[in-house]
């Protein structure tokens, strides 16, 4: 007996699709070996139609897929647009040849069933409305009209022209005639449910002279659309329920035994398990809407249904659309932190992965808001201005080719706590959700800037210092000037290889920045930060105000400022001495290369006079040049 298991008999009708699930023993070899679906020929040979190696036969082109689910020890063969030619004997199996482990499957595709000539077939989806047409001769124009449903030999009246309505059709069935028509009446049955399916007879008149019509009503359960998504990726359920429910509340629910638990609806209900990672977006006025779920988890797999009803809850007899979501644990999306913690006044650096094949895509960072259907307004992007309220404290650093970009948010407050999304205009699967938790600070921040009230005077030299603890000793220190399109790292001179230090004096660790001479355009936010390669760490921000020299204020010449810098604790000198010819070069603000490259490339004019002094405790006194 074969250890592979599946359905022995599969039957369907022309035009439909089937999903055949084959189960295999849970072993490492089985999980990774080739899976196949082949058709058994009369000669005993089994011709491969599709395999997990990527093979797809001509007759299955565009209508079949084979997907392996190693975590469930199953693989699924989906075949659409069935024809009677697909009827036959097949094998689903494992192994490098089609003679390995397999299971025999018989597929039978029938024609759409035919009924007697006088039977009209009506095929409708659950929740929809059917209009049954009943013709009669003029002699029965004034006779009683009725519609009954066949139950065995009996035919039970559903509705008639004397205003009788069967209780199970109450408020759902109406009998009417259109305009001046004298030979036809109609019966509408709305909010169709599965038990409405069956054979109906409509009748005008009584006895042998009565006119009768047969109607076969088929009420279709929604065929779930199969969605295969990777762990940590995102899924969008596109729901189009039709104009008749355009004004009703919409919902997405997840089937759980016989109930369907609402995940989100347009009345403000939302399942806490999806907090921070779900959005419901109306698409148009015809009732179309979509639900996006990011950060997919293993437990998100299951049967989903969207629908509409004034209550915002599932109701029998209302239109629905269905999906089966599979979550593949062998994901291409890297595992990143789902919770990032910060403290008030501090900063966070959030790494956002994106598809490395799409390094030129636009990157964004948005704040998920819980109100109503959930929304995610963009706070910053590679070509998006920083949102009001985030000036000077939010920047996006793209790292082309690394498959990630970094978002830094500083000057944190407890109001910054919440959910944020990383997204690009490229591969929509790569949307990640981060929960930011900001707690009250219990100690001084790691980076401190002095002076804290920074006011620079035009034409003079201005220096601000950033004190850092010994734990950042080996990391790269930088100053950058914040602008609406990022924080542009200021040029510096390479001080040469820094001496390694055995001891570290906590008080002497300083990186300073000097503006010489100060200009009006130097006003703005400056950040002091640490990083290791492309991994950004802590940052702190300071606003430098620039004012005109007031009459009588002493003029400090640059040498005095430098002398003062010499008296300061040992520093890593990052002094500006950019040559005049470098002023003409412009750096693309979207490039965040390391400081040496930026210096070589030249810099934006207003940043050329700014420099930072990075001090070392290794006995190398920093001095301005």
């Amino acid at each position: 007996q074969s250890p592979i298991f599946g359905p022995q008999d599969v039957s369907s009708i022309e035009g439909n699709s089937v999903s055949i699930t084959c189960y295999y023993p849970d072993t490492s070899v089985n999980r990774h070996t080739r899976k196949y679906w082949c058709r058994q020929g009369a000669n005993g040979y089994c011709a491969t139609l599709i395999s997990s190696n990527g093979y797809l036969s001509k007759e299955y082109s565009g209508r079949a897929s084979l997907i392996n689910f190693p975590e469930n020890s199953t693989f699924v063969i989906n075949i659409a647009h069935l024809t009677q030619e697909d009827t036959g004997s097949y094998k689903c199996g494992l192994g490098t040849t089609n003679r390995g482990l397999f299971f025999d499957v018989s597929l039978e595709v029938s024609q759409v069933p035919e009924f007697p000539n006088d039977t009209h077939v009506y095929t409708k989806d659950i929740g929809r409305t059917v209009t049954i047409e009943c013709r009669f001769k003029e002699g029965n124009a004034h006779s009683k009209k009725s519609l009954c449903k066949k139950r065995g030999e009996a035919c039970e009246v559903v509705i008639d022209s004397t205003e009788y309505v069967d209780p199970s059709y109450k408020d759902r069935a109406i009998l009417f005639m259109k305009g001046t028509s004298r030979d036809i009446f109609y019966v509408n049955i709305s909010h169709l449910i599965p038990s409405d399916a069956g054979l109906y007879v409509c009748q005008a008149g009584e006895g042998p002279s009565a006119d009768k019509n047969n109607a076969d009503l088929q009420v279709l359960e929604p065929e779930p659309e199969l969605l295969y998504k990777d762990l940590r990726s995102s899924v969008t359920f596109e729901c189009d329920l039709g104009r008749e429910v355009a004004n009703d509340a919409k919902y997405l629910c997840r089937k759980n035994k016989e109930t369907c638990d609402v995940i989100i609806n347009t009345l403000g209900k939302r399942d806490p398990a999806f907090e921070g990672r779900i959005l419901l977006t109306p698409r148009d006025d015809n009732g179309r809407f979509s639900v996006l779920i990011t950060g997919l988890r293993k437990e998100d797999a299951g049967h989903y249904q969207c629908g509409a009803h004034s209550s915002g809850l599932p109701q029998e007899g209302w239109p629905v659309q269905a999906w089966q979501l599979f979550v593949n644990e062998e994901s291409t999306i890297p595992n990143s932190r789902s919770v990032v913690k910060g403290v008030t006044g501090g900063s966070v650096a959030i790494v956002c992965p994106y598809n490395p094949k799409e390094s030129s895509s636009l990157k964004y960072w948005c704040h998920w808001e819980a109100d109503e259907n959930g929304r995610c307004p963009v706070l910053v992007g590679t070509q998006a201005l920083v949102q009001e309220g985030y000036e000077g404290r939010l920047a996006l650093f793209d790292q082309p080719g690394s498959g990630a970009y970094t978002v830094i948010l500083n000057q944190l407050t407890t109001q910054d706590s919440g959910f944020y999304w990383c997204l690009t205009d490229g591969d929509s699967r790569w949307r990640t959700t981060i929960e930011l938790q900001v707690a009250e600070a219990t100690k001084k921040p790691d980076l401190e800037v002095t002076p804290q009230n920074a006011t620079a005077v035009i034409g003079e030299t201005f220096t601000i210092s950033c004190h850092y603890p010994c734990k950042f000793y080996s990391q790269e220190k930088y100053w950058c000037k914040w602008s609406n399109d990022g924080c542009h790292i200021l040029p510096s001179h390479d001080e040469g290889a820094r001496q390694s230090s055995v001891s570290c004096d906590q008080s002497s660790q300083i990186v300073s920045m000097t503006l010489n001479p100060v200009k009006k355009e130097d006003e703005g936010w400056y950040w002091c930060g640490v990083k290791e390669g492309q991994v950004y760490g802590e940052t702190t921000a300071i606003y430098v105000a620039v004012e005109e020299r007031t009459r009588g204020s002493p003029h400090i010449n640059p040498t005095d400022a430098n002398a003062r810098a010499k008296d300061a604790p040992e520093e890593e000198a990052m002094e500006s001495s950019v040559r005049e010819d470098e002023n003409k070069a412009n750096l693309d603000p979207r490039l965040f290369a390391d400081e040496r490259e930026i210096q070589n490339a030249g810099d934006q004019a207003q940043e050329n006079r700014a420099s930072g002094n990075a001090g070392s405790a290794g006995g190398q006194s920093g001095s301005s040049k």
Epitope: Q8, V10, T21, P194, N256
Partner: nanobody, 126 residues
Framework: QVQLVESGGGLVQPGGSLRLSCAAS????????MGWFRQAPGKEREFVTA??????????YYADSVKGRFTISRDNARNTVYLQMNSLKPEDTAVYYC?????????????????WGQGTLVTVSS
């Protein structure tokens, strides 16, 4: 809730036939799979057969021990599933249980079905 009621069990001679019925009531529109399991005295409950449906497609599953002898079928209008048992053997003697599952994607052989009937006894003996 879904209620399941089995019928059709009884005493039959080896080589004989029997037809079991399982009528479902309640929220039957949520059911996607119905199966038959059996439990012989002193043994664990085992999978016999199942039928799964989605739209107008159906999928029938059989245990190796009953393949070719037992047939499962479904009457959609009556919300009933039938088990036609031919060429019965003494080892088929057991209490036969009908079960219903709401998920299309769980392994039909597993006993983690959502609803179960009370069972009907089938005895194959001469």
């Amino acid at each position: 809730q879904v209620q399941l009621v089995e019928s059709g069990g009884g005493l039959v001679q080896p080589g004989g036939s029997l037809r079991l019925s399982c009528a479902a009531s309640g929220r039957t529109s949520s059911i996607s799979t119905m199966g038959w399991f059996r439990q012989a005295p002193g043994k664990e409950r085992e999978f016999v057969t199942a039928i799964r449906w989605s739209g107008s497609s159906s999928y029938k599953y059989y245990a190796d021990s009953v393949k070719g002898r037992f047939t499962i079928s479904r009457d959609n209008a009556r919300n009933t599933v039938y088990l036609q048992m031919n060429s019965l053997k003494p080892e088929d003697t057991a209490v036969y249980y009908c079960a219903a599952q709401m998920s299309l994607w769980r392994d039909p052989r597993e006993i983690d079905y959502d609803y179960w009937g009370q069972g009907t006894l089938v005895t194959v003996s001469s």
